[in-house]
């Protein structure tokens, strides 16, 4: 679809409000360190320029591509070299290399201060004084901290953020109304960011085919009544949307996502019976709702899979004619019958089936060769089932905090070279699988748990990629997307690791720990636990438990003391000495 002016076309199709919001998100995701005011200025300049192109598409520079226009604008930032270092070299390149260069410099862990929530009255005053600036600031702060956040979904979060302030700033008890809503948005936002990060990693590191396979499996589980052709069409459209967003093409992405939501709702009769409620909602809510919709019921009397994929004499002929289509049909048929399997398990089964056909269709007797292919699936299915059973039992026994601690120890022993903050963050998130998934019945546990673990392990992979320190992490992250979790599960204690030097400063605590929230206090204790394991990787569970129990008692005691700081200083020395003795340091 060629247009005289791409920027005018997008501005008219999206409207001024969406255009400005999406350009702000795009710029903040690229230049994560730039001050808010600088970004607003850049966005306003781009918007004014776009309006001149709307008025006259033949005006100067209106024929330039969006990447050229946006890249040129980003490259006008005066402090690019000082603030971003080698990212400034991107500006010497031509499109499309310049945009690729910007994408490569997106930072998953930018060095930005933690967002501190002001008092409710302060926030409400700011909201009432200038609602537009207040909401722009929200987009900016989230986008720069989450450079792969799904832009059209961020518009939805901003809409909810605005609604929360509109409602709660008029309430009798503003804080009671607002704070739970902000907590919910923060937690949902982190989860949304992590899920999208996996989609982008899948596309960028493993290619479109890998993403499409994931989408076929997931959409087939969700829409088991839809025909294969319908699922294929949805997969193609969804792949385009996510390719655009992950590539920084946020205007196209948002518009195409809206088109996809419209298509799904206009064709819901041939897609799913569960879409009715979603399709009655406004656009942003509708798109979100469709993305989260529950699986439709499986059609009754689905025939056995073996007939078409094992028993048929045409298996190799059908495979040879169109390999990816045939494998796609296999994945579709298997997934629609198995909402109880994780997507990654379904992809492992499809990969096993593909490998078997590659080998057997070249054999003397292909049918004899692949006749038992479904038997190869059994151990692949049982491995995650057993793992989830064991870990849910452990979670129920320990509770979330202690379950997280067990995982902290487990993962620190596997990959002790990884930075302590990363190990704490990832292990805490791995531990949340318990409360998230173990409450579900058996039929829902695996898709919940293993697909969630894929998202969390991707966080480890992208953080580790920035500063690689462990060959084992690199290997598990890069060899196979669907086997990441089994790869990490299979890692034993790293025997090559040289224990970290003991540093008393690491285990010195102060009275400020007493004023921290329960979550922050847990993080402090879990940070200490990781450091302990790094000093003494061969420490037993019992030894570590004893030290951690002593540590908890020490914190509790000193936080009750009159002179807290003195208590932390004196009792802290004793604790360090006792811990060293207990661990034989």
């Amino acid at each position: 679809d060629a247009h005289k002016s791409e920027v005018a076309h997008r501005f008219k199709d999206l409207g001024e409000e969406n255009f400005k919001a999406l350009v702000l998100i795009a710029f903040a995701q690229y230049l994560q360190q730039c001050p808010f005011e600088d970004h607003v200025k850049l966005v306003n300049e781009v918007t004014e320029f776009a309006k001149t192109c709307v008025a006259d598409e033949s005006a100067e520079n209106c024929d330039k591509s969006l990447h050229t226009l946006f890249g040129d604008k980003l490259c006008t930032v005066a402090t690019l070299r000082e603030t971003y270092g080698e990212m400034a070299d991107c500006c010497a390149k031509q499109e499309p290399e310049r945009n690729e260069c910007f994408l490569q410099h997106k930072d998953d862990n930018p060095n930005l201060p933690r967002l501190v929530r002001p008092e409710v009255d302060v926030m409400c005053t700011a909201f009432h004084d200038n609602e537009e600036t207040f909401l722009k600031k929200y987009l900016y702060e989230i986008a720069r901290r989450h450079p792969y956040f799904y832009a059209p979904e961020l518009l939805f979060f901003a809409k909810r953020y605005k609604a929360a302030f509109t409602e709660c700033c008029q309430a009798a008890d503003k804080a009671a109304c607002l704070l739970p809503k902000l907590d919910e948005l923060r937690d949902e936002g982190k989860a949304s960011s992590a899920k999208q990060r996996l989609k982008c990693a899948s596309l960028q590191k493993f290619g479109e085919r890998a993403f499409k396979a994931w989408a076929v499996a997931r959409l087939s589980q969700r829409f088991p009544k839809a025909e294969f052709a319908e699922v294929s069409k949805l997969v193609t459209d969804l792949t385009k949307v996510h390719t655009e967003c992950c590539h920084g093409d946020l205007l196209e992405c948002a518009d195409d996502r809206a088109d996809l939501a419209k298509y799904i709702c206009e064709n819901q009769d041939s897609i799913s019976s569960k879409l009715k409620e979603c399709c009655e909602k406004p656009l942003l809510e509708k798109s979100h709702c469709i993305a989260e919709v529950e699986n439709d019921e499986m059609p009754a009397d689905l025939p056995s899979l073996a007939a078409d994929f094992v028993e048929s004499k045409d298996v190799c002929k059908n495979y040879a004619e169109a390999k990816d289509v045939f494998l796609g049909m296999f994945l579709y048929e298997y997934a629609r019958r198995h909402p109880d399997y994780s997507v990654v398990l379904l992809l492992r089964l499809a990969k096993t089936y593909e490998t078997t056909l590659e080998k057997c269709c070249a054999a003397a007797d292909p049918h004899e060769c692949y006749a038992k292919v479904f038997d190869e699936f059994k151990p692949l299915v049982e491995e995650p089932q057993n793992l989830i059973k064991q870990n849910c039992e452990l979670f129920e026994q320990l509770g979330e905090y202690k379950f997280q601690n067990a995982l902290l120890v487990r993962y620190t022993k596997k990959v002790p070279q990884v930075s302590t903050p990363t190990l704490v963050e990832v292990s805490r998130n791995l531990g949340k699988v318990g409360s998230k998934c173990c409450k579900h019945p058996e039929a829902k546990r695996m898709p919940c748990a293993e697909d969630y673990l894929s998202v969390v392990l991707n966080q480890l992979c992208v953080l580790h990629e920035k500063t690689p320190v462990s060959d084992r992490v690199t290997k598990c992250c890069t060899e196979s997307l669907v086997n990441r979790r089994p790869c990490f599960s299979a890692l034993e204690v790293d025997e090559t690791y040289v224990p970290k030097e003991f540093n008393a400063e690491t285990f010195t605590f102060h009275a400020d720990i007493c004023t921290l929230s329960e979550k922050e206090r847990q993080i402090k204790k879990q940070t200490a636990l990781v450091e302990l394991v790094k000093h003494k990787p061969k420490a037993t569970k019992e030894q570590l438990k004893a030290v951690m129990d002593d540590f908890a008692a020490f914190v509790e005691k000193c936080c009750k003391a009159d002179d807290k700081e003195t208590c932390f200083a004196e009792e802290g020395k004793k604790l360090v000495a006792a811990s060293q003795a207990a661990l034989g340091l």
Epitope: D13, L14, G15, E16, N18, K159, D259, K262, L283
Partner: nanobody
């Protein structure tokens, strides 16, 4: 939720004028971009004009540019469409719509009125 009610339609001779109004009730009118769309018999619904929530940006379909003017009065919660130099091909049901953004595409509008009939005779 926003409720939209159009008025001002009617029968007019070619070359004449009409002013359509759209009264909004419910959620804050000023929080929405607004648009006018129309649908002639046996034809697809088509975009006419849009106005941003601040009122600072307006955009028109080529077929009405220079003849129609969209405006809004946030104090009165009302959207207007001033239609001059009307032509027989302007005959249609005119719909007012509210949405997140001042787009020319109907998919970005979440709330719609019931429509008001405009008939231009030659």
């Amino acid at each position: 939720e926003v409720q939209l009610v159009e008025s001002g339609g009617g029968l007019v001779q070619a070359g004449g004028s009409l002013r359509l109004s759209c009264a909004a009730s419910g959620r804050a009118f000023s929080s929405y971009a607004m648009g006018w769309f129309r649908q002639a018999p046996r034809k697809e619904r088509e975009f006419v004009a849009t106005i941003s929530l601040s009122g600072g940006y307006t955009y028109y379909a080529d077929s009405v540019k220079g003849r129609f003017t969209i405006s809004r009065d946030n104090a009165k919660n009302t959207l207007y469409l001033q239609m001059n130099s009307l032509k027989p091909e302007d005959t249609a049901v005119y719909y007012c719509a509210a949405g997140e953004s001042s787009s020319r595409q109907d998919k970005w509008y979440d709330y719609w009125g019931q429509g008001t009939q405009v008939t231009v005779s030659s």
